[in-house]
């Protein structure tokens, strides 16, 4: 029988009546066009909904938009279009919501052709009131908030000017012209690239990288011959053109661009690309594209300085620049990432790492599941996960994999069981241990979301027909109840729940279609009465993450420490609540060679934990570029993995001697940098 259809499944008592009393319908009094939804702040219950409708006329397009606001998690909405003077809002800019709980919102309006500049509507009280502001420029991008100060905004204009506001968009100042890309760094720093000879595209590879730490009063050129740049964790990356040819290399800085080191990564040609897949304050995952139109490349993981890289995964699926990759950070368990590889026969397979890229393996075949037609051996196969690539290929996959930091261990994804990803209709699988083991959760494709930190999982079948049924589980997807939320089925368009998975409200969005009209409609269901009581100590059990062999003294050790968590028992039907904080207890592990990566000039042979010297470097002095100087490295081949907390045990020694010579291969040496003030 399908999951949840066993008679033994514990049924939640009287749930139909409880949910019926907590189901709120809202019909939006406008024609169906597009709808976008944004949450304003955390735990505020404020949602903004923007509906837009385009009517193509003979010469131009007539547009109409409406703005709605809810302050009870979507149970009721109020039309507040009059607060923005019934102005048409440009959906391509979305709603720019301020960081944290600032309550700030910026909407960018459509203006008539001949106007001097654009127009924005600003709110700093969670969209209760808006102020109209006319801009001295036409915006090219959405307003970007400084992560440190939500009063500081930056935007690029259609004329490639970099504009900054220090008073939440009230007054704007152009601080630089000829800007291609701008990003906020830490401490209200702005990094941006500029062109000299005409355009961003024409100057690609000859751009300059600039920095301002005082919102445009003074500037420093921190890089030349720049192709592009990116920020990840505490690292600033720039891809820089080589002097002699059309190749480029990655340089990295950990001091906001004052000093640079060349990353020990392969250079790439014109048709190739680099991509930061994930980064934190400890390390970075970098994808380096393979030459030719292969659709794959190599993942490298960095050391703690972002300079020395270890090869992590070959044949990593990543279509052209800005294309699709399935690389997914499993946020519900430390160190876990899932992605896809393109095998020699062009089939796509899913790989998982539990130790931040140290080793990759196939996903374990779910218990009680059969291998599909892609499997050569019907008894041996793996689970393969559908992610961005499958969605881009228009497979019947409505959602990417889902995990939440506060729903420890839970991962939900569409997948198939075989030797490779299948084009057949997928099922939904769940892992409760961060990806080590999997179970089929639902038959066929579904939309799904996590509520109350994992206390409830909600799902809706993906169907081309109108729907009126929602499924929910209170035991991490083992058993399912179905609830008919409306008599009249709707064409379903999406599930919306507050980011962070702490809410107990879910909104089902869709439209109704009658003979002449079609209207947006939302149903918001509050599950608070299903989880009647607050969870107590007895509702939780202790769980050791990353446990694979209890007889191993270091069982559960990943990156030098193990973590025990208090997890909700599957049988407990209670509220974790909004204030739920994951309870965990770390224990430091003894160091082993697994806690070290191979240093510059060393590599690990397959299935070996020892680092050996690269044959081509044997007997040579190891000299490499660091902070624009040449360094001499005395090493026995090991460097501690970033973020690894192990103590004691094995301890390989390492020493770096400064040769005090300038690094000729470093295109971003400090000598080439200059400063200027406005």
């Amino acid at each position: 029988s399908a999951p949840g259809e066993d008679e033994e499944c514990g049924r939640v008592r009287d749930f139909v009546a409880k949910l019926a009393n907590n189901t709120h319908q809202h019909v939006f009094d406008d024609l169906r066009g597009s709808v976008s939804l944004s949450w304003v702040g955390d735990s505020t219950g404020v949602i903004l909904v923007l509906t837009t409708f385009h009517v193509p006329l003979v010469i131009m397009t007539f547009g109409q938009s409406k703005l709605y606001r809810s302050e009870d998690y979507g149970k009721n909405f109020k039309d507040i279009t009059d607060l923005i003077n019934n102005t048409f809002i440009r959906t391509e800019f979305g709603m720019a919501i301020g960081p944290e709980n600032s309550g700030k919102v910026v909407l960018t309006a459509e203006v008539s052709g001949g106007s001097r500049g654009g127009r924005i509507f600003r709110s700093s009280d969670f969209a209760k009131n808006f102020v109209q502001t006319d801009l001295p420029f036409h915006p090219l991008t959405q307003m970007m908030y400084s992560p440190q100060n939500s009063d500081y905004l930056l935007a690029l204009s259609t004329e490639n000017g970099l504009w900054v506001s220090k008073n939440f968009g009230g007054k704007w100042e152009e601080i630089h012209k000829a800007v291609c890309l701008a990003k906020w760094g830490s401490d209200n720093t702005i990094f941006f690239t500029t062109y000299a000879n005409g355009s961003c595209k024409a100057d690609l590879g000859a751009l300059e990288l600039w920095r301002t730490s005082d919102l445009g009063k003074s500037f420093k050129t921190i890089g030349v011959k720049i192709y592009s740049f990116g920020l990840g964790g505490r690292f600033l990356f720039a891809s820089v053109m080589a002097d002699k040819d059309t190749t480029r290399r990655i340089h990295v800085s950990t001091d906001q661009g004052d000093t640079w080191s060349m990353a020990q990564l392969p250079s790439v040609g014109q048709e190739q690309f680099y991509s930061i897949l994930a980064a934190n304050d400890d390390m970075v995952f970098m994808h380096v594209d393979e030459p030719g139109d292969t659709g794959f490349g190599t993942i490298f993981t960095s050391d703690d300085r972002g300079i020395v890289y270890s090869k992590s995964l070959d044949r990593h699926l990543y279509t052209t620049t800005g294309g699709e990759t399935d690389f997914t950070n499993v946020t519900s368990l430390r160190g876990v990432y899932i992605t896809s590889v393109l095998s020699e026969d062009n089939s796509i397979q899913t790989m998982i790492t539990f130790d931040q890229g140290g080793r990759w393996t196939h996903l374990r075949k779910p218990e009680n599941s059969e291998c599909d037609a892609t499997a050569k051996n019907k008894n041996e196969c793996s689970l393969h996960i559908h992610a961005s690539y499958s969605i881009s290929q228009k497979l019947n996959v409505p959602m990417a994999p889902l995990s939440e930091p506060n729903a420890v261990g839970i991962v939900i994804a569409h997948g198939s069981v075989g030797d490779a990803i299948s084009v057949m209709v997928p099922d939904v699988y769940i892992s409760d241990d961060g990806g080590y083991s999997w179970t089929k959760m639902l038959e066929g494709p579904h939309y799904y979301t996590i509520l109350d930190s994992g206390g409830i999982i909600v799902a809706i079948e993906h169907s081309s027909r109108p729907i009126n049924v929602i499924k929910f589980s209170t035991d991490e997807g083992q058993c399912w109840q179905t609830y008919t939320f409306t008599r009249d089925p709707i064409y379903f368009t999406g599930l919306a729940s507050e980011p962070g998975a702490r809410s107990m409200n879910i909104s089902i969005w869709g439209f109704t279609e009658s003979f002449l009209t079609s209207q947006w409609v939302s149903y918001t269901i509050d599950f608070k009465d299903i989880l009647e009581r607050n969870c107590e100590e007895k509702d939780y059990t202790i769980w050791l993450a990353h446990s694979t062999d209890p007889e191993d003294y270091e069982d559960g050790c990943i990156l030098g420490y193990k973590e025990q968590f208090l997890r909700l028992r599957k049988s407990s039907v209670c509220q974790n609540g909004r204030d739920y904080v994951v309870t965990k207890q770390p224990s430091i592990c003894l160091c082993s060679l697994e806690d070290f990566l191979c240093d510059f000039g060393y590599y690990r042979p397959e299935n070996d934990s020892k680092c050996v010297e690269q044959p081509e470097l044997k007997g040579h002095d190891l000299e490499f570029c660091l902070y624009g100087r040449e360094e001499h490295l005395t090493t026995n081949g090991y460097r501690k993995i970033p973020g690894d907390k192990c103590q004691g045990g094995v301890n390989p020694v390492r020493e770096v001697k400064d040769l005090k010579k300038k690094c000729t291969s470093n295109f971003l040496s400090p000598e080439k940098q200059n400063s200027k003030s406005n």
């Epitope: 059990t541 202790i542 050791l544 990353h546 007889e551 003294y553 025990q564 049988s571």
Partner: antibody
Framework: QVQLVQSGAEVKKPGSSVKVSCKAS????????ISWVRQAPGQGLEWMGG????????NYAQKFQGRVTITADESTSTAYMELSSLRSEDTAVYYC?????????????????WGQGTTVTVSS | DIQMTQSPSTLSASVGDRVTITCRAS??????LAWYQQKPGKAPKLLIY???SLESGVPSRFSGSGSGTEFTLTISSLQPDDFATYYC????????FGGGTKVEIK
């Protein structure tokens, strides 16, 4: 082969406390929870609580909360159960048992190794 | 706490008989149930974990089934060594045991 060896029989007065030890040998003590289970004469089994030696995370049955303290010493691979405010109803055989473990969950797979039991008699 | 109700409390059977003991949980415990055998003056011995998984070294005549709230321990052909008291134990709440079933010679 894992073994759990418990301390010897005890005779106690009402109102006093008793501390029973349980020493593990031949296995990875730190990675398994140790439960304490008692059995009054002619009665069934009753779980009192348990501890995970690594980190010392203990939890107790509601009935014994406040009266029982379970501890573990990783260096000697020994778990302890102390029961205070003893009364005659506490007369029983007290067992320590290792919670079997196949995954990260410490308490879900039954108790696969048991101590020989310690008889505690409470009498005035 | 979750209550475990075991039945029957006593069972008379002969060698070679097929014996079935049931255990009911007061709420769903998924498959988190263990069965033990205890002989007088001895510590209990684990037979079955996770409702149906046989502990290593336990004869295959013992089997467990069920999930949710209803569970069964079956001895397919009773042997002389099997006369003992059997306990079920749930592990999905604070641990609780059933009251026990004494299997005696008919």
């Amino acid at each position: 082969q894992v073994q759990l060896v418990q301390s010897g029989a005890e005779v106690k007065k009402p109102g006093s406390s008793v501390k029973v030890s349980c020493k593990a040998s031949g296995g990875t003590f730190r990675n398994y929870a140790i439960s304490w289970v008692r059995q009054a004469p002619g009665q069934g089994l009753e779980w009192m609580g348990g501890i995970i030696p690594i980190g010392g995370w203990a939890n107790y049955a509601q009935k014994f909360q406040g009266r029982v303290t379970i501890t573990a010493d990783e260096s000697t691979s020994t778990a302890y159960m102390e029961l205070s405010s003893l009364r005659s109803e506490d007369t029983a055989v007290y067992y320590c048992a290792r919670q079997g473990r196949k995954t990260g969950y410490y308490y879900y797979y039954g108790m696969d190794v048991w101590g020989q039991g310690t008889t505690v008699t409470v009498s005035s | 706490d979750i209550q475990m109700t075991q039945s029957p409390s006593t069972l008379s059977a002969s060698v070679g008989d097929r014996v079935t003991i049931t255990c009911r949980a007061s709420q769903s415990i998924s498959s988190w149930l263990a069965w033990y055998q205890q002989k007088p003056g001895k510590a209990p011995k684990l037979l079955i974990y996770k409702a149906s998984s046989l502990e290593s070294g336990v004869p295959s005549r013992f089997s467990g089934s069920g999930s949710g709230t209803e569970f069964t321990l079956t001895i397919s052909s009773l042997q002389p060594d099997d006369f003992a008291t059997y306990y079920c134990q749930q592990a999905d709440g604070h641990i609780t045991f059933g009251g026990g079933t004494k299997v005696e010679i008919k």
